[in-house]
């Protein structure tokens, strides 16, 4: 039975040209996290495998940095980076948990971080 929940940074905003950390946290389960996939609308950004390490998708190598932790840092943001991002936690023995983050990249300097929220 899957008892865990994923906590994410929720709806966030950042300035064009800046950087942002995408972060998810799995709680309320003793399951072992074996791999975390980071995706943007069906496009793979990066994978962190507990044993094998990090793989960054070639098309994002210049703008994506692994970490901190299981999170992902997006750099040199453009307005086209606006959209949904998903952290997909593969766990053993529970199975797969998915968290959602919405990022809005703003032209101006009024970008503020949104509230945290949970997805069961």
């Amino acid at each position: 039975m899957m008892t865990g929940t994923i906590e994410t940074t929720g709806n966030i905003s950042a300035e064009k040209g800046g950087s942002i950390i995408l972060q998810c946290h799995l709680s309320s389960t003793t399951a072992q996290v074996t791999q975390v996939n980071w995706e943007q609308q069906d496009q793979l950004l990066a994978i962190c495998n507990a044993d094998l390490g990090w793989h960054i998708s070639p098309s994002f190598k210049d703008r994506v940095a692994p970490g901190p932790g299981l999170g992902l840092t997006l750099q040199s943001l453009t307005v086209n980076d606006t959209g949904e991002y998903f952290c997909i936690y593969h766990t053993y023995p529970d199975g797969t948990y998915t968290g959602r983050i919405f990022l809005e990249v703003l032209e101006s300097s009024v970008a503020e971080h949104g509230a945290r929220f949970q997805i069961p």
């Epitope: 791999q35 994978i47 044993d51 094998l52």
Partner: antibody
């Protein structure tokens, strides 16, 4: 290019322990970033994953076999091993060792990239 | 665990024709799917990973598609050496699971 070779007895008696070894050549397990896996195929049937181990010792087993399976790695001999206890005729199969995730860093996929030729194990008295 | 179901169990095709093999996952595996080919008396060989990317040395007549729970392996023009059993397999969730296989035989 990594290569794998299974070895072990071809005949095991019921209730005994099946022991197989896979020798890896063409690269060092101790520096390799991949899983070492065992997969079996009963006569005329499909493939069944038994379990995998990482060089650090992290192990993952098929829940249906977990109580009977032990996979271990000996980096000094560049080998990894399978032990399956309390065997029955249902454990008769071709046993394959395989390497999984050898291309993960470059291509981001985890699949069974490299296979041994397989060794037939019959459980019979 | 994720159950992988392949259909049909047997596919009879004439050389030169197209073969379409299906694989269904009991829950979404995104694009984390591999296809293998196995000939009699041989170990399986990786054909496709990531649902659609051909492994090194695999001919262009093999193509994979699909995402989520529905996947397809297509062999555009069957050659004599393509008659074999094909398996799909999901990862990374543990336990790794294979489909039951599709045997492609000569019609």
């Amino acid at each position: 290019q990594l290569q794998l070779q299974e070895s072990g007895p071809g005949l095991v008696k019921p209730s005994e322990t099946l022991s197989l070894t896979c020798t890896v050549s063409g690269g060092s397990i101790s520096s390799g970033s991949y899983y070492l896996a065992w997969i079996r195929q009963p006569p005329g049937k499909g493939l069944e994953w038994i379990g995998s181990i990482f060089r650090s010792g992290s192990t993952y087993y098929n829940p249906s076999l977990e109580s009977r399976v032990t996979i271990s790695v000996d980096t000094s001999k560049n080998q990894f091993s399978l032990k399956l206890s309390s065997v029955t005729a249902a454990d008769t199969a071709v046993y394959y060792c395989a390497i999984e995730g050898a291309n993960f860093k470059d291509f981001g996929y985890v699949a069974f990239d490299i296979w041994g030729q397989g060794t037939t194990v019959t459980v019979s008295s | 665990e994720i159950v992988m179901t392949q259909s049909p169990a047997t596919l009879s095709v004439s050389p030169g024709e197209r073969a379409t093999l299906s694989c269904r996952a009991s829950q979404s595996v995104s694009s984390n799917l591999a296809w293998y080919q196995q000939k009699p008396g041989q170990a399986p060989r990786l054909l496709i990973y990531g649902a659609s990317t051909r492994a090194t040395g695999i001919p262009a007549r093999f193509s994979g598609s699909g995402s989520g729970t529905e996947f397809t392996l297509t062999i555009s023009s069957l050659q004599s050496e393509d008659f074999a059993v094909y398996y799909c397999q999901q990862s990374p969730p543990w336990p790794r699971t294979f489909g039951g296989g599709t045997k492609v035989e000569i019609k």
